[in-house]
């Protein structure tokens, strides 16, 4: 467990000409606030998916009124940090969306009006416990400067907040196999063992021996999916046996999401997944156009010349999402055939093919036997992307060039002696055994466990293996 912290340093016009108009005016004073949404960076969720790592809203900033004729300065910001608590391990790679919102304080009927000023997104690597990382992002003509960090909440430590620390039981040193907790040298790393059988996918623990469930799962070992179908009422009492959860009225009741947005509950509130062209806490904001620069990572904005027509971002190879904000793990689609190794080079995919295969996706099976001769009467057999020789009797090796010693593999069982023979090998069996490889015991009364020996061969005679 831990907290992701975001510090906004400034929000104002970016460098260069084309400065944006101030969002506030003497007639329409306003104030800013920010929203941050975090997702695990390696997740293959859709770009519009909920903020799986969490989300947070800042406080409102000071009221600002534009000075007539003055260019838009850096706008006054809310105090304090935006904090996004995370319950589980810190993923190390994460995607963020930071939205700058304007709250208009004129005489609106029904309270203040909100509108989205700017939206930036990115994907970063970050170890928990590290220093503040600084960043600058541009959205259209606006520029946002901010810092962020992830820190673990005691007793968790480490770059993923998965190790636990406990006060030392002995003053001098930690227990066997346990290290001191840097930077808390007076504490010791604690082994974290969840309750036996706790689902590794759907459960976690913050204390040894416990099993706490991720959202959507229940039961003592977090193996029961939450379902309301077996409940007496849609929001019946919580029960680990039936898997019924979510008592009382839910935050999505009545669907607070406008414009066709879909609502999903979060631990603290709700999250609206908005259709393309709509944004905001409740999908109430429309009118984002290509002029707002909504496409990240080199994406090209298509359509959306006016607020009434939705834009589409065409993303460069390697990015996806409605705003090209998400890097694609193209190797997860397993494009390399025939066991080829996939390499995502960023600008392109490469397949490293196994022997005997070729082509951009290792799709071509080479003629393994072409130009390859097997010596001494052997025949070439294709298979597995590499040629193989099936050798004539008495020869072996990759190309049948080696004379085989048929006795090398000790083929005679039960102490039988092997003799090389022009047509193969012969086993001279020890008393009490018979068969081509001396594999059958002879019964004391002279009968064998198998049909009698062929005519002309007595038990104990050498058996020639043809």
């Amino acid at each position: 467990a831990g907290v992701f912290e975001l510090q906004i340093h400034s929000f104002g016009p970016g460098p260069g000409p084309g400065a944006p108009r101030s969002p506030c005016s003497a007639r329409l004073p306003c104030r800013l606030f920010f929203r941050v949404c975090l997702k695990p960076g390696l997740s293959e969720e859709a770009a519009e998916s909920p903020c799986a790592l969490g989300a947070a809203l800042s406080a409102r900033g000071p009221v600002y009124t534009e000075q007539p004729g003055a260019p838009a300065p850096d706008l006054p910001l809310p105090d304090g940090l935006l904090q996004v608590p995370f319950r589980d391990a810190w993923p190390g790679t994460f995607s963020f969306i930071i939205e700058t919102w304007r709250e208009e304080l004129g005489d609106q009927i029904g309270g203040p009006a909100w509108s989205l000023l700017a939206r930036v997104a990115g994907r970063r690597r970050l170890a928990a416990g590290g220093p503040w990382a600084r960043d600058i992002q541009r959205a259209g003509a606006w520029e946002l400067r901010f810092s962020y960090r992830a820190r673990c909440e005691p007793p968790a430590v480490g770059t993923a907040c998965t190790r636990l620390c406990r006060p030392r039981s002995a003053p001098s040193r930690c227990g066997p196999g346990l290290r001191p907790c840097a930077p808390l040298e007076d504490e010791c790393e604690a082994p974290l063992v969840c309750r036996a059988g706790c689902s590794p996918e759907h459960g976690f623990c913050e204390q040894p021996g416990e099993c706490r469930c991720l959202e959507g799962w229940t039961g003592p070992l977090c193996t029961v999916p939450v379902s309301t179908s077996s409940c007496l009422s849609p929001r019946g009492p919580s029960s680990a046996t039936t898997g019924c959860l979510v008592p009382g009225p839910g935050p999505c009741d009545g669907n607070p999401c406008a414009n066709g947005g879909s609502c999903s509950e979060t631990p603290r509130s709700f999250e609206c997944t908005c259709p393309r062209g709509f944004y905001g806490l409740r999908c109430e904001v429309s009118g984002v156009t290509c002029a707002d620069g909504p496409c990240f990572n080199g994406g090209l904005c298509v359509g959306g010349a006016d607020p009434d027509s939705a834009y589409i971002c065409h993303c460069p190879p390697g990015f996806q999402g409605s705003n090209c904000e998400k890097r694609v793990d193209r190797c997860s689609l397993q494009p390399c055939r025939n066991g080829g190794l996939c390499l995502d080079l960023g600008h392109a995919l490469r397949c490293r093919c196994r022997a005997g295969f070729a082509g951009p996706r290792c799709e071509h099976d080479l003629d393994d036997c072409a130009g390859r001769a097997c010596a001494n009467g052997g025949t070439c057999v294709e298979g597995g992307g590499a040629h193989r020789c099936s050798c004539a009797l008495g020869f072996g090796g990759r190309d049948c060039r080696e004379r085989a010693d048929p006795c090398a593999a000790r083929p005679c069982a039960h102490g039988g002696r092997c003799y090389a023979h022009f047509s193969g090998l012969v086993c001279a069996c020890a008393p009490g055994y018979m068969g081509a490889r001396c594999e059958f015991p002879v019964h004391p009364d002279g009968a064998s466990a198998l049909p009698a020996a062929p005519p002309g061969l007595r038990p104990g005679d050498p058996q020639r293996y043809l």
Partner: antibody
Framework: QVQLQESGPGLVKPSETLSLTCTVS????????WSWIRQSPGKGLEWIGY???????NYNPSLKSRVTISVDTSKNQFSLNLNSVTAADTAFYFC????????????WGQGTLVTVSS | EIVLTQSPDTLSLSPGERATLSCRAS???????LAWYQQKPGQAPRLLIY???SRATGIPDRFSGSGSGTDFTLTISRLEPEDFEVYYC?????????FGQGTRLEIK
């Protein structure tokens, strides 16, 4: 090294269809967007459109009603069809590869002159 | 569409001098998605700069790009004889992709 080579007739009659093919060597056509650009003395450089795999295309609105760009991954080629041509379509036509960090053009063919005349 | 206007149309300088070419957009170019090209007679354009300031592979460091919003600049710090060609800017933030009309750099 990626190389692009345009091919097709250098002379097209008015009202007919201009058809050009770009053959890509030294790289897989599946991994990038591919574009056509033309250059005429009167209009300078003009982007025509692009294709990605075969399912994503985008065309210049000024030409959209007349243009089709398609790709043949098996031959490592992509093609331009511009129908109902007039003398105003006389230009050098370039095929180009679109870059990996955005929709700029990092590799170009040497270009082919197409004249529209009866 | 975003109209790109390059200035001057022709720039006359001597080898060794510094060249400053301007490209102005009719509206803000998203996220500095602007490229510069050089074109020699009878050849295709060659990419010099993308992302307003990133040099393409193999481009000498005397070429540099700057700017954001609506104003962008290509600078050639010390002109070599082979630099006297035509230069184009191109925006790729908003469809349709558009080019400037070009600036001819000639020897004074």
């Amino acid at each position: 090294q990626v190389q692009l080579q345009e091919s097709g007739p250098g002379l097209v009659k008015p009202s007919e269809t201009l058809s050009l093919t770009c053959t890509v060597s030294g790289g897989s056509i599946s991994s990038y967007y591919w574009s056509w650009i033309r250059q005429s003395p009167g209009k300078g450089l003009e982007w025509i459109g692009y294709v990605y795999y075969s399912d994503i295309t985008n065309y210049n609105p000024s030409l959209k009603s007349r243009v089709t760009i398609s790709v043949d991954t098996s031959k490592n080629q992509f093609s331009l069809n511009l129908n109902s041509v007039t003398a105003a379509d006389t230009a050098f036509y370039f095929c180009a590869r679109i870059g990996v960090a955005g929709f700029y053009f990092d590799y170009w063919g040497q270009g082919t002159l197409v004249t529209v005349s009866s | 569409e975003i109209v790109l206007t390059q200035s001057p149309d022709t720039l006359s300088l001597s080898p060794g001098e510094r060249a400053t070419l301007s490209c102005r957009a009719s509206q803000s170019v998203s996220r500095r998605y602007l490229a510069w090209y050089q074109q020699k007679p009878g050849q295709a354009p060659r990419l010099l700069i993308y992302g307003a300031s990133s040099r393409a592979t193999g481009i000498p460091d005397r070429f540099s790009g700057s700017g954001s919003g609506t104003d962008f600049t290509l600078t050639i710090s010390r002109l070599e004889p082979e630099d006297f060609e035509v230069y184009y800017c191109q925006q790729y933030g908003t469809s349709p992709i558009t080019f400037g009309q070009g600036t001819r750099l000639e020897i004074k």
